[in-house]
């Protein structure tokens, strides 16, 4: 369960804490490639890669979904798998890569006036970390949003990127997900070096926008692995 994945407070894969971000020496802040919260996941190492176990899609990255690694495999053993690109087979929306949804068993572009009708989802925040509303009211939240003509604006709670308006994706913000802007050219992006090494990002970034990919910044090739800065660049 997500609860068991979130039972540790260690933060991994962070940039150097002092002296600014790679490529920005002396700045008073560091640009972190995503603030990570790995949870108590013994599989999660970079050098000794193993698949990232999961119980539901929301535990995986924005470009992954949760499923059994083999067709007809043991449903009790699920890992985060790479999302399916356009025109690939699917069984549900979460299997399709951001910007797509599952229609008639095939991943198709969500640009084609796809609206999910109504989301009725109850989130009970019973993780290892305490969640309190600032005004002290109930911690049980019901999302009920009609999606016929309006999609989530920036900062709106979402379940997946298809819930967000154009130019936004659904990304983790603490232990929820909200609509954030898709990254533009030159913006810092998160490059997970090996699938499963990323943990759960507390402050997750969106993916790079159309025609862009997340690549190491050219002038950072000499930097150490841990401090390399990735940015959205033209293909």
């Amino acid at each position: 369960t997500l609860n068991s994945v979130l039972n540790s407070n260690a933060i991994k894969n962070l940039p150097p804490p002092l002296g600014g971000a790679a490529g920005h020496p002396g700045s008073a802040v560091s640009a972190a490639p995503g603030i990570l919260y790995p949870g108590g996941n013994k599989y999660q190492t970079i050098d000794n890669y193993q698949p990232y176990p999961c119980a539901e899609d929301e535990e995986c990255g924005t470009d992954e979904y949760c499923a059994s690694p083999t067709r007809g495999g043991d449903a009790g053993v699920q890992i985060c798998l790479a999302c399916r690109k356009r025109r690939k087979r699917c069984m549900r929306h979460a299997m399709c890569c951001p910007g797509n949804y599952c229609k008639n068993g095939i991943c198709v572009s969500s640009d084609q006036n796809h609206f999910r009708g109504e989301i009725e989802e109850t989130i009970t925040e019973s993780f290892g970390n305490d969640h309190s509303t600032l005004d002290g009211y109930s911690r049980r939240t019901t999302l009920s949003s009609k999606m016929y003509h309006t999609k989530g604006q920036e900062g709106s709670v979402c379940l997946r990127s298809s819930d967000c308006a154009s130019g936004l994706c659904c990304a983790r913000h603490f232990w929820s997900k909200i609509c954030k802007p898709v990254l533009k050219e030159g913006q810092v992006c998160t490059k997970h070096r090996r699938k499963g090494s990323h943990g759960l990002e507390i402050f997750q970034r969106c993916y790079c926008g159309e025609g862009l990919s997340c690549r190491i910044q050219k002038d950072h090739h000499q930097a150490s692995n841990s401090s390399r800065l990735h940015t959205c660049q033209r293909h």
């Epitope: 802040v29 560091s30 640009a31 972190a32 490639p33 995503g34 603030i35 305490d130 969640h131 309190s132 509303t133 600032l134 005004d135 920036e154 900062g155 709670v157 913000h173 603490f174 929820s176 909200i178 954030k180 802007p181 990254l183 913006q187 810092v188 992006c189 507390i202 402050f203 970034r205 969106c206």
Partner: nanobody, 117 residues
Framework: EVQLVESGGGLVQAGGSLRLSCAAS????????MGWFRQAPGKEREFVAG????????YYADSVKGRFTISGDNAKNTVYLQMNSLKPEDTAIYYC??????????WGQGTQVTVSS
């Protein structure tokens, strides 16, 4: 350019209190929320507490629940961490970080908190 500056750290006896502040300057865009993290010598950085302006919620690690309180003012770009009933194991460098709408995640340089027994 955004700068996050932490202050309020120091040496305190076990059972004592400290109040940390983190001020953001140079921001021309909004923040979704801010968090406090800490790193003790030889250990990994860990989440301590967070506040979401967007969702109106606060978050705490189990180890500090009931002892630490996070608060802040988004309009003033400031977040605070009130630390009571401090323990020697709270000794660490405390960092604040911000979830920014320009897609950067900003870190401060940290403030040292030392709790003596």
């Amino acid at each position: 350019e955004v700068q996050l500056v932490e202050s309020g750290g120091g040496l305190v006896q076990a059972g004592g209190s400290l109040r940390l502040s983190c001020a953001a300057s140079g921001r021309t865009f909004s923040s979704y929320g801010m968090g406090w993290f800490r790193q003790a010598p030889g250990k990994e950085r860990e989440f301590v507490a967070g506040i979401s302006w967007t969702l109106g919620r606060t978050y705490y690690a189990d180890s500090v629940k009931g002892r630490f309180t996070i608060s802040g003012d988004n309009a003033k770009n400031t977040v605070y961490l009130q630390m009571n009933s401090l323990k020697p194991e709270d000794t660490a460098i405390y960092y604040c970080a911000s979830d920014e709408s320009d897609a950067y995640n900003y870190w401060g340089q940290g403030t040292q908190v030392t709790v003596s027994s």
